[in-house]
């Protein structure tokens, strides 16, 4: 088996809870990407299950701004531009990792958190429950 | 903008790149997200813009497995169950944070990375370019 030698180039944590507390480099790879979904595509308006994007801002979290989708209708837009309630607009959700300041207001101390966000909406055929 | 006051109860980073490198507590919040709708919905099959889920695996990243949506059709499924090419199935993309060990094999040093993933598909009206 492989035994990983202590790498002299590794940052050394003096924290007594090590390795529960680790160093994370926030110099993000691929940083210059457009985080505002409204700018990157207009699918939210052109979809048959259109959605509104709500800005969820929290200065105690990284990233501090997350855009949440909310479907505009219960049904879907048909070819005539009307809402068809025989179909359903539903949110597509994704679990993401975020960092939360802990203790609050500490500029360099965070806790990992998993949160569920709605990314957009899709139009689905409803599940019909037949009464026996 | 908000100026966060220096909290005397905060862990103090001696890192010269502060606050680029931060301390992160890995006792994750919401670890047991097993009632997570992302896991239990079958929208990928019931959508008018159905998608397949492809495994994107990287053992040196957390999460090691990320599922990428690929729209099954260029068009959307109509009421008769046929593909209607007057509409387009398009991927909804989301930027997510992942953790990567850096330097490799250092047990207490990570780097955040942003990656763009396709979470699902939605059906949109195509943009028609009229020839002048």
């Amino acid at each position: 088996g492989i035994t990983i030698p202590r790498n002299p180039g590794c940052p050394n944590s003096e924290d007594k809870n090590f390795p529960r507390t680790v160093m994370v480099n926030l110099n993000i790879h691929n940083r210059n990407t457009n985080t505002n979904p409204k700018r990157s595509s207009d699918y939210y308006n052109r979809s048959t299950s259109p959605w509104n994007l709500h800005r969820n801002e929290d200065p105690e979290r990284y990233p501090s701004v997350i855009w949440e989708a909310q479907c505009r209708h219960l049904g879907c837009i048909n070819a005539d531009g009307n809402v068809d309630y025989h179909m359903n607009s539903v949110p597509i959700q994704q679990e993401i990792l975020v960092l939360r300041r802990e203790p609050p207001h500490c500029p360099n101390s965070f806790r990992l958190e998993k949160i569920l966000v709605s990314v957009g909406c899709t139009c689905v055929t409803p599940i019909v429950h037949h009464v026996q | 903008g908000i100026t966060i006051p220096r909290n005397p109860g905060c862990p103090n980073s001696e890192d010269k790149n502060f606050p680029r490198t931060v301390m992160v507590n890995l006792n994750i919040h919401n670890r047991n997200t097993n009632t997570n709708p992302k896991r239990s919905s079958d929208y990928y099959n019931r959508s008018t813009s159905p998608w397949n889920l492809h495994r994107n695996e990287d053992p040196e990243r957390y999460p090691s497995v990320i599922w990428e949506a690929q729209c099954r059709h260029l068009g959307c499924i109509n009421a008769d169950g046929n593909v209607d090419y007057h509409m387009n199935s398009v991927p909804i993309q989301q930027e997510i944070l992942v953790l990567r060990r850096e330097p490799p094999h250092c047990p207490n040093s990570f780097r955040l990375e942003k990656i763009l993933v396709s979470v699902g598909c939605t059906c949109v009206t195509p943009i028609v370019h009229h020839v002048q």
């Epitope: 529960r20 | 896991r39 239990s40 079958d42 497995v65 094999h105 047990p107």
Partner: antibody
Framework: QVQLVQSGAEVKKPGSSVKVSCKAS????????ISWVRQAPGQGLEWMGS????????NYAQKFQGRVTITADESTSTAYMELSSLRSEDTAVYYC??????????WGQGTLVTVSS | DIQMTQSPSSLSASVGDRVTITCRAS??????LNWYQQKPGKAPKLLIY???SLQSGVPSRFSGSGSGTDFTLTISSLQPEDFAVYYC????????FGQGTKVEIK
């Protein structure tokens, strides 16, 4: 190629504890979880819990909560499963498996634990 | 916990036969369903993940289908090395396994 090599068979008395090890060879733990699954003689498979060695995150099946402890030592690429307050019904083959949090793709060879007075 | 029910619990078949095993979940699990093969005295082996994706190195005679609550494992042409116990497993919630289906020689 990832290989998970488990410790040898154990015979234990009721009320005692057992600690089974699982060493990853041919690669490090990487960012996967390690899950523990047991199989009583002639029975099916039962998930006990998991750990993500990178972070030390653990998740236990409700049935085993308070009786099982899963740990990992990254320096030796070894995961451990300790089961306490053993009873005869705990006689089983205990497997470790690499867990992507979606499926178990590599398994150890299994460790037979016999609980008998 | 999500209950997984396999049927049949055992079946007898001949080499070359087409074999189908079904698995039903007590609630919807999307496509988070895996199939494993286990031979006597050996650890389980992953065959199919995410309901229909073939794990690398697994012969193409194995296939999986289904979504929601009902799933199927099909062996298109049974080979001598396929006689074993097959388990389904969900990972929508904490993992649970079906009780197993034993495929025996007729």
């Amino acid at each position: 190629q990832v290989q998970l090599v488990q410790s040898g068979a154990e015979v234990k008395k009721p009320g005692s504890s057992v600690k089974v090890s699982c060493k990853a060879s041919g690669g490090t733990f990487s960012s996967y979880a390690i899950s523990w699954v047991r199989q009583a003689p002639g029975q099916g498979l039962e998930w006990m819990g998991s750990i993500i060695p990178w972070f030390g995150w653990t998740n236990y099946a409700q049935k085993f909560q308070g009786r099982v402890t899963i740990t990992a030592d990254e320096s030796t690429s070894t995961a451990y499963m300790e089961l306490s307050s053993l009873r005869s019904e705990d006689t089983a083959v205990y497997y470790c498996a690499r867990d992507s949090e979606y499926y178990f793709d590599h398994w150890g060879q299994g460790t037979l634990v016999t609980v008998s007075s | 916990d999500i209950q997984m029910t396999q049927s049949p619990s055992s079946l007898s078949a001949s080499v070359g036969d087409r074999v189908t095993i079904t698995c039903r979940a007590s609630q919807g699990i999307s496509n988070w369903l895996n199939w494993y093969q286990q031979k006597p005295g050996k650890a389980p082996k992953l065959l199919i993940y995410a309901a229909s994706s073939l794990q690398s190195g697994v012969p193409s005679r194995f296939s999986g289908s289904g979504s929601g609550t009902d799933f199927t494992l099909t062996i298109s042409s049974l080979q001598p090395e396929d006689f074993a116990v097959y388990y389904c497993q969900q990972y929508s919630d904490d993992p649970t396994f079906g009780q197993g289906t034993k495929v025996e020689i007729k």
